[in-house]
Interface confidence: medium
């Protein structure tokens, strides 16, 4: 899912593509915003459209059913858990649930793409809006955490422990009210829009160039660019306070949470450098020509599945790298009645089965 | 079903002037960008102006720039093309067109056409 | 302005015939449209997106082409093709059509 233009003066193709489109030619145009005429037709996207109806349906297939099955485990780990979540425990627990509201869009896109949009207008607001909610809410989520340790470690501030509970839930809240607020263009602009040329229906945006501009840069600085500099900044300070105090414990400790950012990192980046690329296109700095236009739009659609794959490999990561982790999951197994467990009630149980499987007394991790 | 029809065509000397109209049904016409098009007898399609669907901008080719003025009333779902300055070379059968609209965007070619009004220039 | 020149300009043709009219631009275009015209009557939106067939228009029609030459075919003519097919471009304005392709029967 990949996810124009007010009151301009007639811009035909050759002068829109000497012009670097004012008129970007691949995209939605809302007929109300535009008192223009006879623009551009589109590029033909032959080859990217039939891309997408190869790729992307079994990717995103692929996607829901590791990303349900994993986000499912990941939050049942910690809600069966006896005592109250910790702080990041909590932000794992709203993360889970973002990265599972958010595959549980694929079966709709990947229809999509396959075929055409059949769900209507309602549906393609609803699922545009919950794509894009649980897209920023990954990375302000994952933002979240690293303050959260960088307070707990660097400060020796526990802000979410010591103060009230309900200071993490606020938090969380705040989060998901922010995302809401970005994800309005979805629930005004996006529609069901029939592709005369494709003779499809498309879920679509139907808005003005500027307003598509601006809210790729909103996703490009919100959901990439603010989240990862928080992470990088935070966990960097961290890594030096630990290597300081020569922490070996808490270095071991502080394994999972590196791995689950640089795992953000390379896999949005590819995805956000085709959208700056997009952008550039869009206001002009780089040139607009129906070859780059479809090489563009492949690479979105090969980054962006990249992008989702993350949904994916949080709960992966968890259980390769965090022991408590996996501790918990066999043990939740076991509770279960799962059959052909017996090996498991050899596993050493942990000292703090009650402590968050992703942070010790000492406010750090302790994924080994 | 869309249907297009226009009037006020007739003979009128060089010089001269003419207003057509262009009376449209079976479709929201307030939506769409509207043409006007000609074709000289046993000649071939000419373009001769266009109007945004609010009316806001307005396009001609230089043949007719600054003679001929194309106009709508979106309250009445009718197109005009005003003619001043008439030449015997504007002597035509006059069609009213729409734009289709692709992705919310008006498109220079024509999906539905009227059945044309003939102007005769001529002394 | 972007001058299309169709060839031929007359064509007769039989029943069954299959038919290739070209309409090259004197430059590039990128997409081309396609209208069909019988005597007395208005012109019909025949292939739009140089390739696209229009609402009604039967699948013996086809278009392609890119850049400066484009064609439009008709695999087997029918009586009711015997008509006059213009080209028309929007890459450059003015809006241009070419000078039309006068298909008869032989």
């Known amino acids: 899912m990949v996810l124009e233009v007010s009151d301009h003066q007639v811009l035909n193709d050759a002068e829109v593509a000497a012009l670097l489109e004012n008129f970007s030619s691949s995209y939605d145009y809302g007929e109300n915003e535009s008192d223009s005429c006879c623009t551009s037709p589109p590029c033909p996207q032959d080859f990217s459209l039939n891309f997408d109806r190869a790729f992307l349906p079994a990717l995103y297939s692929l996607l829901f059913l590791l990303g349900l099955l994993g986000n499912g485990a990941v939050a049942a780990v910690l809600l069966s858990r006896r005592t109250a979540l910790s702080s990041t425990d909590t932000f794992l627990l709203h993360l889970a649930v973002a990265d599972t509201l958010l595959v549980l869009t694929l079966p709709l896109w990947a229809v999509d793409a396959a075929v055409q949009w059949v769900f209507g207008s309602g549906l393609c607001k609803v699922a545009g809006a919950l794509f894009n909610i649980n897209f920023y809410a990954g990375a302000l989520l994952l933002a979240c955490i690293s303050f959260d340790r960088y307070l707990n470690i660097v400060h020796a501030t526990q802000l979410y422990r010591r103060g009230p509970p309900a200071r993490v839930t606020l938090t969380c809240l705040a989060v998901w009210g922010l995302c809401l607020l970005f994800a309005l263009p979805d629930f005004i602009f996006l529609s069901a829009h029939h592709d005369e040329r494709l003779n499809a229906t498309h879920c679509q945006y139907n808005f003005p160039q500027v307003g598509r501009t601006a809210l790729r840069v909103l996703q490009l600085v919100a959901g990439f660019l603010l989240p990862l500099l928080v992470m990088a900044y935070c966990y960097a300070h961290i890594l030096a306070v630990l290597l300081v105090s020569r922490g070996q414990r808490r270095l071991r400790a502080m394994r999972l949470v590196v791995v689950v950012v640089v795992a953000f990192a390379l896999c949005w980046t590819p995805y956000h450098l085709v959208v700056l690329v997009d952008i550039l296109m869009d206001l002009g700095a780089l040139a607009r020509n129906c070859g780059r236009e479809s090489r563009v739009d492949v690479a979105k659609s090969v980054t962006s599945g990249l992008g989702y794959m993350h949904c994916c490999l949080n709960p992966l990561l968890y259980a390769f790298v965090g022991v408590k982790f996996r501790e918990r999951m066999w043990m939740l197994l076991l509770r279960l009645g799962c059959p052909n467990q017996r090996g498991l009630q050899r596993q050493p149980s942990s000292s703090r089965r009650d402590s968050s499987w992703s942070e010790t007394s000492e406010a750090s991790y302790s994924g080994l | 079903e869309v249907q297009l029809l226009e009037s006020g065509g007739g003979l009128v000397q060089p010089g001269g002037s003419l207003r057509l109209s262009c009376a449209a049904s079976?479709?929201?016409?307030?939506?769409?960008?509207m043409s006007w098009v000609r074709q000289a007898p046993g000649k071939g399609l000419e373009w001769v102006a266009t109007i945004s669907h609010g009316g806001t901008y307005t396009y001609y080719p230089d043949s007719v720039k600054g003679r001929f003025t194309i106009s709508r009333d979106n309250a009445k779902n009718t197109l005009y093309l005003q003619m001043n300055s008439l030449r015997a070379e504007d002597t035509a059968v006059y069609y009213c067109a729409r734009h289709p609209i692709y992705s919310g965007n008006y498109q220079g070619y024509f999906d539905y056409w009227g059945q044309g009004t003939l102007v005769t220039v001529s002394s | 302005d972007i001058q299309l020149t169709q060839s031929p300009s007359f064509l007769s043709a039989s029943v069954g015939d299959r038919v290739t009219i070209t309409c090259r631009a004197s430059s590039g275009v990128n997409y081309l449209y396609w209208y069909q015209q019988k005597p007395g009557k208005a012109p019909k939106l025949w292939i739009y997106f140089t390739s696209t067939l229009a609402s009604g228009v039967p699948s013996r029609f086809s278009g392609s082409g890119s850049g400066n030459e484009y064609t439009l075919t008709i695999s087997s003519l029918q009586p009711e093709d015997f008509a006059t097919y213009y080209c028309?471009?929007?890459?450059?304005?003015?809006?241009?059509f070419g000078q039309g392709t006068k298909l008869e029967i032989k």
């Open positions: 028309q471009q929007f890459t450059s304005s003015p809006y241009t």
């Open positions: 079976g479709f929201t016409f307030t939506s769409y960008a």
